[in-house]
Interface confidence: medium
């Protein structure tokens, strides 16, 4: 009983339950392969609890091991389109600080119009994650087709 | 020591660890695109801890942010079959209550025979999730090829 | 206040936060379809907190429901290569103890060069997970293209 009461009084943040799910806002100008994300209840089902957005890129606020997941669907796409515009590749990585820059997850579209994957990775407070889409095709901004999120799993 | 004892005495349900992993039972009649699911240890490795099945659809019992994941493999399928029968699309959404109806996750098969994805989304007690497979191809019932699950992540 | 102190004193392991993320080490000899994994901070972003590696295969140390995820990318691959070498299939399963041998997750590459999926499954202490890649194509060893991991979710 004492435990249950104490648990309710503890702010969720102290349990380390940082989590975010983002929807696509826009792509960058021609020479910038990054996807720019947005999140918040006013936009629908996206949210940020802990992490923050910095110019459309996701910044981590708590050290730990995170589950990072992403799905990107190319807009108005058929397998013919996808193969004609090959290679179209998506990479998720730490883009700042520069000293920690690394690619975490990479997928090519080949003859498909959607990629989806997830992985566990250690992230540190201040790490900014970038999602780079290279190629000439544009992603769909439908919120059930393109999304990106992280979930804190353990210290 | 006191803490560990208290923790063991607390029912898991009070920690909000709702989780379910389902296997395909059957598809619906001709005009019903929904997949019908089943779960329970007697069936193999599927289970429901918290959520419930309502006529083969998954009903949520606890408010919170959930990780929803799915894999569907088409039966008797090759890339030729898949492209010939295109578009075959899978959508996971809240189908009831009607006031909360929305598509959460959508993928097309294009020239592939399997789709797999996952996302974080807020769900509320009473939300029923439906998985709609549109197109003429049928899903495999092999439990390692087609499955659907949810995991409560945080309030 | 008492609760927070107690929580900090508890070793993480007692909370059941077993987690592992592995990178590909090598493939097996000709008649062995298994992928051999490696993990640890010296290798980069891979790690084992709880589970262990036994001759390149992942052994579970704590009973519970786990989220198992994998991504495998074929090396030197195009959609033409993938379809010409079809069927190339990846299966994740319990390979020992033999009494619990079962396939948990299975995907074919068809015309794609990457597969990625995840699922919830009950695992028991001592279960060893094997990942079998059948076909003539080889997997990429790039750590952002091929990885395998598990995360303890609940008892």
């Amino acid at each position: 009983q004492r435990f249950a009461q104490a648990q309710q009084q503890l702010p969720l943040e102290s349990l380390g339950w940082d989590v975010a799910e983002l929807q696509l806002n826009h792509t960058g100008p021609q020479q910038d392969p990054r996807l720019y994300w947005q999140g918040g209840p006013a936009l629908g089902r996206s949210f940020l609890h802990g992490p923050e957005l910095d110019k459309g890129q996701l910044r981590i606020h708590r050290d730990g091991i995170y589950m990072v997941h992403i799905q990107v669907t190319l807009a108005i796409c058929s397998s013919t389109t996808a193969s004609r515009h090959h290679p179209t590749t998506l990479a998720v990585g730490i883009c700042s600080p520069a000293s920690r820059s690394i690619s975490l997850l990479r997928l090519s579209f080949h003859q498909g119009c959607t990629i989806a994957s997830q992985r566990l990775t250690p992230l540190a407070r201040g790490d900014t994650l970038c999602t780079n889409l290279t190629g000439t095709l544009l992603p769909s901004r439908n919120t059930d087709e393109t999304f990106f999120g992280v979930q804190w799993v353990r210290p | 020591q006191r803490f560990a004892q208290a923790q063991q005495q607390l029912p898991l349900e009070s920690l909000g660890w709702d989780v379910a992993e389902l296997q395909l039972n059957h598809t619906g009649p001709q005009q019903d695109p929904r997949l019908y699911w089943q779960g329970g240890p007697a069936l193999g490795r599927s289970f429901l801890h918290g959520p419930e099945l309502d006529k083969g659809q998954l009903r949520i019992h606890r408010d919170g942010i959930y990780m929803v994941h799915i894999q569907v493999t088409l039966a008797i399928c090759s890339s030729t079959t898949a492209s010939r029968h295109h578009p075959t699309t899978l959508a996971v959404g809240i189908c009831s209550p009607a006031s909360r109806s929305i598509s959460l996750l959508r993928l097309s098969f294009h020239q592939g025979c399997t789709i797999a994805s996952q996302r974080l989304t807020p769900l509320a007690r009473g939300d029923t999730l439906c998985t709609n497979l549109t197109g003429t191809l049928l899903p495999s019932r092999n439990t390692d090829e087609t499955f659907f699950g949810v995991q409560w992540v945080r309030p | 206040q008492r609760f927070a102190q107690a929580q900090q004193q508890l070793p993480l392991e007692s909370l059941g936060w077993d987690v592992a993320e592995l990178q590909l080490n090598h493939t097996g000899p000709q008649q062995d379809p298994r992928l051999y994994w490696q993990g640890g901070p010296a290798l980069g972003r891979s790690f084992l907190h709880g589970p262990e590696l036994d001759k390149g295969q992942l052994r579970i140390h704590r009973d519970g429901i786990y989220m198992v995820h994998i991504q495998v990318t074929l090396a030197i691959c195009s959609s033409t290569t993938a379809s010409r070498h079809h069927p190339t299939t990846l299966a994740v399963g319990i390979c020992s103890p033999a009494s619990r041998s079962i396939s948990l997750l299975r995907l074919s590459f068809h015309q794609g060069c990457t597969i990625a999926s995840q699922r919830l499954t009950p695992l028991a202490r001592g279960d060893t997970l094997c990942t079998n890649l059948t076909g003539t194509l080889l997997p990429s060893r790039n750590t952002d293209e091929t990885f395998f991991g598990v995360q303890w979710v609940r008892p």
Epitope: G44, A75, R141, N142 | - | -
Partner: antibody, heavy 122, light 110 residues
Framework: EVQLVESGGGLVQPGGSLRLSCAAS????????MNWVRQAPGKGLEWVSD????????YYADSVKGRFTISRDNAKNTLTLQMNSLKPEDTALYYC???????????????WGQGTQVIVAS | QAVVTQEPSLSVSPGGTVTLTCGLT?????????PVWYQQTPGQAPRLLIY???SRHSGVPSRFSGSITGNKAILTITGAQPEDEADYYC??????????FGGGTRLTVL
């Protein structure tokens, strides 16, 4: 087959109100951004408003801002345009249009209804 | 704000080739304007023809093609057919989520 059927048009006096509706079928309505586009008699196309798939974000052309309100009901597969303080220059054929969902808020209108006529005159 | 410009009218002989242009009163059209072309035959709703410069929508014949040449977006019809007689609208993406249509080009197939 995608179908968009508009209704609610008619003759109204300047300063009056009208409510246009669009019934959608043949696709998963709740996943698409939806738009209203109008065409004055003998003139070109003018984008009026759009709404995101969940109804949380809306945009309006400057010419209608503050007077028109776009909304949607995903449970009923309907899109509506509430038009207040109507002016003679709002006279047009109003099309309900589906946005293909391209990123960058680049509207690509891949399915159109047949339109409903609105006439604002005294 | 820039205005999207199109030729008011053009004509082409059956089997001939015609080029419709789409420009801006100030500045050049670039790929960042994501040019889109729509066709509206008399008494019908518009239909999507070409999007993001040069991608043909499903069901659109291969005689229709899009490009950017110089400072304008171009719609080329190679081997025009009588059924191509219609109004053609170009739309360009401008800043602040604005999507501007041109005034349209009436194409006559003589």
């Amino acid at each position: 087959e995608v179908q968009l059927v508009e209704s609610g048009g008619g003759l109204v006096q300047p300063g009056g109100s009208l409510r246009l509706s669009c019934a959608a079928s043949g696709f998963t309505f709740s996943v698409y951004y939806m738009n209203w586009v109008r065409q004055a008699p003998g003139k070109g196309l003018e984008w009026v408003s759009d709404i995101n798939n969940e109804g949380g974000t809306t945009y309006y052309a400057d010419s209608v801002k503050g007077r028109f309100t776009i909304s949607r009901d995903n449970a009923k597969n309907t899109l509506t345009l509430q038009m207040n303080s109507l002016k003679p220059e709002d006279t047009a054929l109003y099309y309900c249009v589906r946005d293909a969902g391209y990123s960058n808020h680049v509207p690509i209108f891949d399915s159109w209804g047949q339109g409903t006529q609105v006439i604002v005159a005294s | 704000q820039a205005v999207v410009t199109q030729e008011p009218s053009l004509s082409v002989s059956p089997g001939g080739t015609v080029t419709l242009t789409c420009g801006l009163t100030s500045g050049s059209v670039t790929s960042d304007n994501f040019p889109v072309w729509y066709q509206q035959t008399p008494g019908q709703a518009p239909r999507l023809l070409i999007y993001t410069i040069n991608s043909r929508h499903s069901g659109v014949p291969s005689r229709f093609s899009g490009s950017i040449t110089g400072n304008k977006a171009i719609l080329t019809i190679t081997g025009a057919q009588p059924e191509d007689e219609a109004d053609y609208y170009c739309a360009l993406y401008l800043e602040n989520f604005a999507n501007e249509f041109g005034g349209g080009t009436r194409l006559t197939v003589l």
